[in-house]
C-alpha cells in the first residue's frame, strides 16, 4: 500500500516556470525553461496552451526540470506553461499549470510611442511627464534630448511603460525614447518617433526620429552601478538597425557608463 | 459559484450521432482535467472519457472509437461527439472535473440520452 | 461486471454505524487512491470522501474512509434517514477511471 491519506487538494499548488537566461532573447541563443514543483514529482509536462501535444516531458524523481530550447527561432517564442505529476494520481490528472511563461525571440523590440502628459505645450513654470510607452513588462527605458549626447534619464519598470518627468524651465525641446532588456543578452527596441515640447504659443509636432537633426542615437544599456558598461558588440543585437540622428556610424557611438538618473 | 451545465441530450435512432456540451463557470476551465461519466437507467456509474490539461485524451475501451471528446478552453466548455449510437448507451451523461490525486469534486446535473427507434 | 466490488445492498437503523466494502486489486485500490461517492435519487453523485480518508468542505465527520491492502471502506456512523442513497466507490488504474457497481443503503 503507496499511497497514505492525502492532504486537501491545496496542497499540490502550481509550479513554477521560468527562463535563462531571459525570457527576451534574440535568435540563436540557448534557453532553458525550469520548471519548479513545490514538492518533489514524478514527471514534468511543458506545453503550449492550444496545442494537444506537450512538447516535452522530463521524467525526474525531484522538485526541478529542466527543458532545453537549443539556438532559439523566433518560432519557438510563444506562451509556454508547465505541469507536474505523481504516479499514484489519476491517469491523466496533472497539478495545475504554471502561470504562463511569454517567450519572445526577436532581433529587435516594437518601437515605442513617446507622449507628453497632460500635453506637450508647457505653461510657465509647468512640469511635464513624458511617457514612453512599449509592449512589454520589466523592461529599461532610456530618454534622450536633442542635441544631448548621453541619455536624459533611465528608467526601470514593471510596467510597460516608463515616465520620465521634466521641470518646466528646461522642458521645450526634441525627444525621443526606446527600451531594451534589463540585462544581457540585450534587445533593443525601435527609437520612437520623436516629440516636440514647446512653450504655450509655439507649435509642437512629431516627426520621425531619422529626419530630425542633431539627435544621438542610443547608446548601450547602461549596466548596474559600479559594473563596466558592456562594450557595444556585447549588447547589440545581430540585425539591429537603430537610425542615428547624427551623421555618424553607428560604430562610432560611445558606450554611456551608467547614468545616476540626473533628472533635468 | 462553480457550476457545471450539460446540454445536447434527446432521442435519437440507433446508429445516429449526438453530441453533448458541458458549460462550466466559476473557475479557469483550461487548468484542470474533465471527463464524462454516465449512467444507465437503475445502474451505476460508467466512466467513459477524460480530457487532460494537455496530452491524448484517454477512453474506457467500450467506447474507443465511437466517441470523441473535446474542449474549448475560450468558451470554457467540455464536449462529447458520440456516433454509432445503440440502444445501450441509453443514459444520463454526466460531465465531471477531476481533483488530485483522483477523484471527481464537482459534477454536473447530466443530461438524458435516449437512443431508441 | 465492475473491476471494484461492493456489495450490493447495505442497510441500518438510525444512529447505528454502517459499513461499506470495495474490493479491487493491486493494478488500482492496492497501488492508488480511493474515493466515495453519495448519489441521493434524482440527483448527480457527491463527492464524500478523496484520497482514500480525506472529507471535502460541507461533508459531515459521520463519513469515514479507510483503505487496506487491495480494499476501501466507507464508514457511516449516526446513521440519518437521509442517508438513503446509493454509496459508489472509485479509484483507478494506469490508464483507466473505475467505479464500483454502487451500494444502496436502506435506512430501516
Known amino acids: 500500500d503507496i499511497t497514505p491519506s492525502v492532504p486537501p487538494a491545496s496542497y499540490h499548488p502550481k509550479p513554477w516556470l521560468g527562463a535563462q537566461p531571459a525570457t527576451v532573447v534574440t535568435p540563436g541563443v540557448n534557453v532553458t525553461l525550469r520548471c519548479r514543483a513545490p514538492q518533489p514529482a514524478w514527471r514534468f509536462g511543458l506545453f503550449k496552451p492550444g496545442e494537444i501535444a506537450p512538447l516535452l516531458f522530463r521524467d525526474v524523481s525531484s522538485e526541478l526540470a529542466e527543458f532545453f530550447l537549443e539556438e532559439v527561432t523566433p518560432a519557438q517564442g510563444g506562451i509556454y506553461r508547465c505541469c507536474y505529476r505523481r504516479p499514484d494520481w489519476g491517469p491523466g490528472v496533472w497539478s495545475q499549470p504554471s502561470d504562463v511563461l511569454e517567450l519572445l525571440v526577436t532581433e529587435e523590440l516594437p518601437r515605442p510611442s513617446l507622449v507628453a502628459l497632460p500635453g506637450p505645450v508647457v505653461g510657465p513654470g509647468a512640469n511635464v511627464s513624458l511617457r514612453c510607452a512599449g509592449r512589454l513588462r520589466n523592461m529599461s527605458f532610456v530618454l534622450y534630448r536633442e542635441g544631448v549626447a548621453a541619455p536624459l534619464q533611465y528608467r526601470h519598470s514593471a510596467q510597460p511603460w516608463a515616465d520620465f518627468t521634466l521641470l518646466g524651465a528646461r522642458a521645450p525641446g526634441t525627444y525621443s525614447c526606446y527600451y531594451h532588456t534589463p540585462s544581457a543578452p540585450y534587445v533593443l527596441s525601435q527609437r520612437s518617433e520623436v516629440l516636440v515640447i514647446s512653450w504655450e504659443g509655439e507649435g509642437p509636432e512629431a516627426r520621425p526620429a531619422s529626419s530630425a537633426p542633431g539627435m544621438q542615437a542610443p547608446g548601450p544599456p547602461p549596466s548596474d552601478p559600479g559594473a563596466q558598461a558592456p562594450s557595444l558588440s556585447s549588447f547589440r543585437p545581430r540585425g539591429l538597425v537603430l537610425q542615428p540622428l547624427l551623421p555618424q556610424t553607428q560604430d562610432s557611438w560611445d558606450p554611456a557608463p551608467p547614468p545616476s538618473d540626473p533628472g533635468v | 459559484e462553480v457550476q457545471l451545465l450539460e446540454s445536447g441530450g434527446g432521442l435519437v435512432q440507433p446508429g445516429g450521432s449526438l453530441r453533448l456540451s458541458c458549460a462550466a463557470s466559476?473557475?479557469?476551465?483550461?487548468?484542470?482535467?474533465w471527463t464524462w461519466v454516465r449512467q444507465a437507467p437503475g445502474k451505476g456509474l460508467e466512466w467513459v472519457s477524460g480530457s487532460p490539461v494537455f496530452g491524448a485524451a484517454n477512453y474506457a475501451q467500450n467506447f474507443q472509437g465511437r466517441f470523441t471528446i473535446s474542449r474549448d478552453n475560450s468558451k470554457n466548455t467540455l464536449y462529447l461527439q458520440m456516433n454509432s449510437l445503440r440502444a445501450e448507451d441509453t443514459a444520463v451523461y454526466y460531465c465531471a472535473k477531476a481533483g488530485i490525486p483522483g477523484h471527481f469534486d464537482i459534477w454536473g446535473q447530466g443530461t438524458l440520452v435516449t437512443v431508441s427507434s | 461486471q465492475s473491476v471494484l466490488t461492493q456489495p450490493p445492498s447495505a442497510s441500518g437503523t438510525p444512529g447505528q454505524r454502517v459499513t461499506i466494502s470495495c474490493s479491487g486489486s493491486?493494478?488500482?485500490?492496492?497501488?492508488?487512491?480511493v474515493s466515495w461517492y453519495q448519489q441521493l435519487p434524482g440527483t448527480a453523485p457527491k463527492l464524500l470522501i478523496y484520497?482514500?480518508?480525506n472529507r471535502p468542505s460541507g461533508v459531515p465527520n459521520r463519513f469515514s474512509g479507510s483503505k487496506s491492502g487491495t480494499s476501501a471502506s466507507l464508514a457511516i456512523s449516526g446513521l440519518r434517514s437521509e442517508d438513503e442513497a446509493d454509496y459508489y466507490c472509485?479509484?483507478?488504474?494506469?490508464?483507466?477511471?473505475?467505479f464500483g457497481g454502487g451500494t444502496k443503503l436502506t435506512v430501516l
Open positions: 466559476g473557475f479557469t476551465f483550461s487548468d484542470y482535467y
Open positions: 472509485q479509484s483507478y488504474d494506469s490508464s483507466s477511471w473505475l
Open positions: 484520497g482514500n480518508s
Open positions: 493491486s493494478s488500482n485500490i492496492g497501488n492508488n487512491y
